[in-house]
Interface confidence: low
């Protein structure tokens, strides 16, 4: 190999050992029969050398550094050449370095031809191994602007006072052009400006200077985004840290097309703007840091550019001004991710502040829109608390547990609507009355409706789940002793069509001691399955529940239990069941921890089933499943 560097070229070539490998056989640079491991060639020198091994690329790397001085004379602007030509260099991993020094008043602009650059973060690498490392200078301090791969959006980087550009090419890469040019500009009065150009839909991840280390103190960095007018851009911060400021405040500023309040100033912790049409700028401004404990300012963010969706121009008004203690969250329902660009899915408040999830609270009217390619990627969860603090005021009061129409009209699916119903302890109880009689979900007769009501105790220490109930059954009402949560959970998009079937009224009633009372009015010829609360885990200790079962005059009810014994073993107290005819008050009492469960029995009149638990030994819980079937009295029951 022969390398000859012209005089006055300000180029230095250094061949040195690369990352040590575990290769057994060492390799040397052979020059004038001497074996060396490092060779430096300066301007005006001509050196002939060879290697002592067949694969020098496994051992050595080459660095070609060109110093460009714009301080003492004219600057060589224009397209930057690879000198010496790659064809004259040995096939080693090579790094071309251009170190440009200029006055503070001079702006320098790196212009990248297509393909543009894509910034990568710490630990990431470029697929083709070609990397561009760019740094600037503040006085004597070097500032890393970033490391970039090909195939991105970054088209220009403007700096002042100097720039160092390192282009790393793997030994096997055929590239023989630098791919960039240098131009002079007027002073930019900031650390740097990065221009990012979008031709169509896509995303770009960008980072503050020195990332993941701290952004230089009290500096300003700007990103200019060129976005076709027919597309929309949204900014989201992926990672940021704030330093400890002594003076001024760290912030980001946006110049947004059409905004009457430019620049728009945001804190880093704010939700960032979305749904922006056309070009915009984003600037990061540091502060004067506390000398004792500076902390670090750093920012990694993503700009997502996509077509405006049909929904993005529609404004939905969610009027929660008359609601109390209610929150509505619109959030992503996780979906399959593909490797190709996936448009973002955002919900926007007042069409500007967009994020992947949004919580609206009661007491206000909210205007929202969607920036999303497929609204089935979102769903809604709502929580509302209805509490009574004064039993004299609430007694006999009723509330409708109905999903407000404003919410039903939103174009995203409702997942859960939870009502937390709170009553004063030992003063009031609750009764739930459905618009349509309910069926209890059991595995013998599962619910197959588009929604169910999940009813559970809302007392933190109490582990009591009454069950899941859906319309189309025989349960006319459910009375509960104390605080509960009722969750309307939807299972299918068809809930929108079936929404009229929902409707539950809660009333505050005088306190009673039983944990729950179910009023059941079976329909002829249908089998009603009922099960004790906390199925699978056992009725809680010392808990009592009842079923008030109506039998019409011309019918007979058959009560059937689904196992021979209850299986409960009592540690203290007794577990018992009372079956009582309501007309005659005649009752049968069964000891659940001793007796076998009754055989199927026939009841001509309405009757009660009451089950009271003892304190069971662990593992011997009380779980009962039974059914009620009506048949006409005229049928011969023998």
């Amino acid at each position: 190999f022969e390398i000859a560097l012209p005089r006055e070229s300000n180029i230095t070539v250094l061949i040195k050992l690369g990352t040590p490998t575990l290769l057994a056989k060492p390799c040397y640079i052979v020059i004038s029969k001497r074996h060396i491991t490092m060779l430096s060639i300066k301007s005006g020198e001509r050196i002939v050398f060879t290697f002592s091994c067949q694969s020098p690329e496994n051992h050595f790397v080459i660095e070609i550094q060109k110093n460009i001085d714009c301080m003492s004379g004219p600057c060589p602007f224009g397209e930057v050449q690879l000198q010496p030509s790659t064809s004259l260099l040995p096939t080693l991993n090579r790094t071309f370095i251009w170190d440009v020094k200029a006055h503070k008043s001079i702006g320098l602009e790196l212009q990248f031809s297509i393909p543009r650059l894509r910034q990568i973060g710490p630990g990431e690498s470029c697929p083709d191994g070609v990397t561009h490392s760019i740094s600037g200078r503040i006085d004597a301090t070097v500032v890393r602007i970033g490391t970039f791969c090909s195939n991105g959006t970054v088209s220009r980087i403007k700096m002042q006072e100097g720039v160092k550009m390192a282009l790393h090419l793997p030994w096997f890469h055929p590239r023989n052009v630098s791919g960039f040019s240098i131009a002079n500009r007027s002073s930019i009065k900031r650390l740097c400006i990065i221009e990012s150009v979008f031709e169509g839909e896509g995303s770009a991840t960008l980072m503050s200077a020195n990332y993941p280390e701290g952004f230089p103190e009290d500096e300003l960095m700007t990103w200019q985004f060129v976005v076709p007018a027919h597309l929309r851009a949204s900014v989201s911060f992926l990672n940021f840290n704030l330093s400890n400021c002594e003076r001024k405040e760290e912030r980001v500023e946006y110049y947004i097309p059409g905004s009457t309040t430019n620049p728009e100033v945001f804190k880093l912790e704010d939700k960032q703007p979305g749904n922006m049409a056309g070009n915009f700028n984003l600037s990061l401004q540091g502060c004067d840091q506390d000398a004792q404990s500076p902390g670090i300012l750093r920012l990694q963010f993503q700009v997502l550019v996509q077509h405006p969706q049909n929904e993005s121009n529609k404004i939905y008004v969610v009027d929660l001004s008359n609601e109390r203690a209610m929150s509505l969250t619109i959030e992503p329902r996780p979906v399959k991710q593909s490797r190709k660009f996936v448009p973002g899915c955002f919900v926007c408040l007042e069409s500007r502040t967009c994020s992947s999830n949004l919580t609206l609270t009661s007491g206000s009217k909210h205007k929202i829109s969607f920036l999303c390619d497929d609204l089935t990627r979102l769903w809604m969860n709502v929580e509302k608390t209805i509490s009574c603090t004064d039993h004299r005021y609430c007694q006999r009061k009723s509330y409708s547990l109905q999903v407000p129409s404003d919410i039903l009209h939103l174009p995203v699916e409702l997942h859960d609507f939870s009502w937390k119903l709170l009553v004063p302890k030992d003063r009031l109880s609750l009764v739930l009355v459905p618009a349509q009689k309910l069926q209890q979900h059991t595995h013998e007769k599962p619910c197959n409706t588009s929604f169910s009501y999940l009813v559970a105790s809302a007392i933190p220490s109490q582990d009591l789940y009454f069950g899941s109930f859906c319309p189309g059954g025989s349960i006319k009402q459910i009375q509960v002793k104390q605080n509960i949560s009722v969750t309307l959970r939807t299972f299918a998009p068809s809930f929108q069509q079936e929404a009229s079937r929902q409707g539950l009224t809660v009333s505050f009633i005088p306190y009673f001691k039983e944990e729950g009372v179910f009023t059941v009015t079976p329909d002829t010829k249908s089998k009603v399955y009922l099960r004790t609360p906390n199925w699978d885990r056992g009725l809680p200790s010392l808990t009592s529940v009842s079923w008030n079962i109506s039998v019409p005059r011309d019918q007979v009810a058959c009560l059937t239990f689904f196992k021979e014994r209850s299986g409960v073993v009592c540690q203290t107290g007794r577990a018992f069941m009372i079956i009582q005819e309501q007309r005659t008050r005649a009752e049968e009492i069964f000891s659940l921890d001793e007796d076998v469960l009754p055989k199927p029995s026939f009841h001509h009149h309405s009757f009660w089933v009451n089950i009271s638990n003892c304190s069971p030994t662990s593992g011997k819980q009380l779980d009962l499943l039974f059914s009620v079937t009506l048949t006409p009295r005229t049928v011969d029951l023998t």
Partner: antibody, heavy 119, light 107 residues
Framework: QVQLVQSGSELKKPGASVKVSCKAS????????MHWVRQAPGQGLEWMGW????????TYADDFKGRFVLSLDTSVSTAYLQISSLKAEDTAVYYC????????????WGQGTLVTVSS | EIVLTQSPATLSLSPGERATLSCRAS??????LHWYQQKSGQSPRLLIK???QSISGIPARFSGSGSGSDFTLTISSVEPEDFAVYYC?????????FGQGTKLEIK
């Protein structure tokens, strides 16, 4: 980070008892239920039951009622599975796993404990 | 009890191919179905919850679909580390059952 660490392998004779422990760390034991799953050699997974870590109340699948006892010691954040009157067909890997009380999905699992019953 | 039937019992594929695993429930279980992966000598790992909800840390090539009684786990492009046994699990009602498993093996 969340971890469930189980006790080591056991070799037992038929008729003996064994107690497998599962120590939870990286979260509060009482915030999640603890489930136990059995896997016989070369076979699939069988859900055995679960224990309510707030109340200590266990629940068993039908095939695991009687000789199997689930218990807790919240002071050391540990759940236990005890099997008495061991039989050769109890030879299996036993896993503890963390779950939700309703509609459980098991997001963290112990490394498994192999119990071998052989004369 | 809910019986879950997985098919096929064994699926032979080459890396880069698409894998489709099926799980059928003996009755409607809405979306109360979860998927797990178990590699030889390891504990199971939760892949998908509630039929289609992804789990943090699980590669995006895994996705689930279905509701009612028919469910599918899809691996869009099988990687070498995906060869394992996959189980579905019902959380609809007591007892919480698992399918018998589908073994995904290298062709």
């Amino acid at each position: 980070q969340v971890q469930l660490v189980q006790s080591g392998s056991e070799l037992k004779k038929p008729g003996a008892s064994v107690k497998v422990s599962c120590k939870a760390s990286g979260y509060t034991l009482t915030d999640f239920s603890m489930h136990w799953v059995r896997q016989a050699p070369g076979q699939g997974l069988e859900w055995m039951g679960w224990i309510n870590t707030e109340t200590g109340a266990p629940t068993y699948a039908d095939d695991f009622k009687g000789r199997f006892v689930l218990s807790l010691d919240t002071s050391v954040s540990t759940a236990y599975l005890q099997i008495s009157s061991l039989k050769a067909e109890d030879t299996a890997v036993y896993y503890c796993s963390r779950g939700r009380d309703y509609d459980p999905h098991f997001d963290y699992w112990g490394q498994g404990t192999l119990v071998t019953v052989s004369s | 009890e809910i019986v879950l039937t997985q098919s096929p019992a064994t699926l032979s594929l080459s890396p880069g191919e698409r894998a489709t695993l099926s799980c059928r429930a003996s009755q409607s279980i809405s979306d109360f179905l979860h998927w797990y992966q178990q590699k030889s000598g390891q504990s199971p790992r939760l892949l998908i919850k509630y039929a289609s909800q992804s789990i943090s840390g699980i590669p995006a090539r895994f996705s689930g679909s279905g509701s009612g009684s028919d469910f599918t786990l899809t691996i869009s492009s099988v990687e070498p580390e995906d060869f394992a046994v996959y189980y579905c699990q019902s959380a609809h009602s007591f007892p919480y059952t698992f399918g018998q498993g589908t073994k995904l093996e290298i062709k």
